[in-house]
């Protein structure tokens, strides 16, 4: 994917000291604060902007590949737009005073240039054939070779952002996505479960037939018991899900009504806050192109390359450069859908999704038949869901916990809150479940307020 727009930093990931809010040289020249610009733009029809010196004039924006050289002299007169110079670009219609600098691919991360920068599109960086991307952060990826699944078979083939998922042959176990011989399995390791028959057989060779058969009998006995248990669990889950569709799926009309007027905050800070649209102040810049400059005031989750979601080719600029602003955003509480919390002595809080208890409470209280829909809405791909189910074998609860942990890990901390989960549950018409989760975590008496942001 294309890197963000910091042009001058080369191979060693050296970072210019931007700690005092100094804006980068990557965007050649300064751009008016986007928040103010949006207010001005909203008065004019689409494709036009308000003249900075005369509020009554709407000037036509410049096409992508060009930048604003001079504002239009009067109504109905042309804006003076000039084409971007080599090494710079604008990816959408704009009224930027200067073009954005082209990104460079991170060679030390194994990245290669998929397509070079043009006046209307930033550099696109990616990985070589038979490699996949591992994201260290929202916009920094490294290329790794796909696993070949030696001594095993390919369960899920290698994808752009996902390594091959291997299933190992008998006598081998999966360690760091490679099939390793069971002879390398030590008692303390997880592999003992998978390599159990082999380990037992090794011990049994020196003794008579009973020592060989006994472990096998025990093993198959355990298998039968577990099958019986799974059968019972399956019936229980079906019963539980039916109950949930009745109890959990419908919330009281008053609550639904109360929510009508609630405006939910965007999932991430509004991109309009970025002082320099193409700049992503991550260490040594971003590998996902932040080339699509937008001055729209709405910020939909679809625009955000949420860590859990398969990233789209375009990422919004990171809102890191203005600490005061970022802090203000962070401290702004997200409205909680639970009215009972509003009525209680405590204001609604984000329960800590860093705490495993929170994630287990979600696992326990989301109807099993709606689980996949739930995690898909959180942004997990079917590929990841299958992989986590496979990795956790027969233990559905652990697979579901792993899915939430994956979402939690990949979602920037300020966004991975119970409010976000609540919003998803509300969209699924499962508000009752959210109440059950809150109840499971807080009990009947409200706990002291948890921190409203995950740190």
């Amino acid at each position: 994917m294309g890197l963000s727009t910091v042009p001058d930093l080369l191979l060693p990931l050296v970072l210019l000291e931007l700690l005092v809010g100094i804006y980068p040289s990557g965007v050649i020249g300064l751009v008016p604060h986007l928040g103010d610009r949006e207010k001005r733009d909203s008065v004019c029809p689409q494709g036009k902007y308000i003249h900075p010196q005369n509020n009554s004039i709407c000037c036509t924006k410049c096409h992508k590949g060009t930048y604003l050289y001079n504002d239009c002299p009067g109504p109905g007169q042309d804006t003076d737009c000039r084409e971007c110079e080599s090494g710079s670009f604008t990816a959408s219609e704009n009224h930027l005073r200067h073009c954005l600098s082209c990104s460079k691919c991170r060679k030390e991360m194994g990245q290669v240039e998929i397509s070079s920068c043009t006046v209307d599109r930033d550099t696109v960086c990616g990985c070589r054939k038979n490699q996949y991307r591992h994201y260290w952060s929202e916009n920094l990826f490294q290329c790794f070779n796909c696993s070949l699944c030696l001594n095993g078979t390919v369960h899920l083939s290698c994808q752009e952002k996902q390594n091959t998922v291997c299933t190992c042959h008998a006598g081998f176990f999966l360690r760091e996505n490679e099939c390793v011989s069971c002879s390398n399995c030590k008692k303390s390791l997880e592999c003992t479960k998978l390599c159990l028959p082999q380990i037992e057989n090794v011990k049994g060779t020196e003794d008579s037939g009973t020592t060989v058969l006994l472990p096998l009998v025990i093993f198959f006995g355990l298998c039968l018991l577990s099958l019986l248990f799974i059968g019972l669990m399956y019936r229980y889950q079906r019963w539980k899900s039916k109950l949930y569709s009745i109890v959990c799926g419908k919330s009281t009309p008053e609550k639904e009504g109360e929510l009508e007027g609630t405006t939910t905050k965007p999932l991430a800070p509004n991109p309009s806050f970025s002082p320099t649209p193409g700049f992503t102040p991550t260490l040594g810049f971003s590998p996902v192109p932040s080339s699509t400059f937008t001055s729209s005031s709405t910020y939909t989750p679809g625009d955000c390359p949420n860590f859990a979601a398969p990233r789209r080719e375009v990422a919004p600029p990171y809102q890191g450069a203005d600490p005061i602003l970022a802090t203000a955003l962070a401290s702004d509480p997200i409205p909680n859908p639970l009215q009972k919390w509003e009525d209680s002595a405590h204001k609604p809080q984000s329960l800590d999704t860093d705490d495993p208890a929170t994630l287990y409470a979600v696992v326990e209280n989301v109807p099993p038949l709606r689980w996949k829909e739930f995690v898909r809405r959180l942004g997990l791909s079917d590929h990841e869901i299958d992989r986590l189910e496979l990795q956790n074998g027969r233990c559905l609860r652990e697979a579901q916990y792993s899915m939430l942990a994956t979402w939690r890990r990949r979602t920037p901390r300020r966004e991975a809150t119970l409010e976000l989960l609540g919003r998803v549950l509300r969209d699924m018409d499962l508000l009752g479940c959210l109440e059950d989760i809150e109840e499971a975590l807080c009990g009947p008496a409200a706990l002291p307020p948890a921190p409203s942001l995950l740190r």
Partner: nanobody, 122 residues
Amino acid sequence: EVQLLESGGGLVQPGGSLRLSCAASGFTFATYSMGWVRQAPGKGLEWVSMIDPEGYHTYYADSVKGRFTISRDNSKNTLYLQMNSLRAEDTAVYYCAETNRPLTYKPWFDYWGQGTLVTVSS
């Protein structure tokens, strides 16, 4: 509250070795990619090395490849950096940090430890 406490720095001769440790608390350490960042005197910040939650993916800056080894012990909530064949240019303050943070985002510095100073000099 997130806390990261780095230790193990000190004065060492060129060619010598050091092992840095970072004790983490206040968050679920085992679910985060972590890394070591350094700041040489009068210079900017640089990612030295990174490791994913399972220890499967690792990254090393070109300047330290083959000399430094990153590892983690999730049961102890600790991140390590084994530094061998140290050079004068490795002199810096070393910090541990979560990789999903832009290092220019000032409030994030509130969650950093004091760092540990590594001085390589004869």
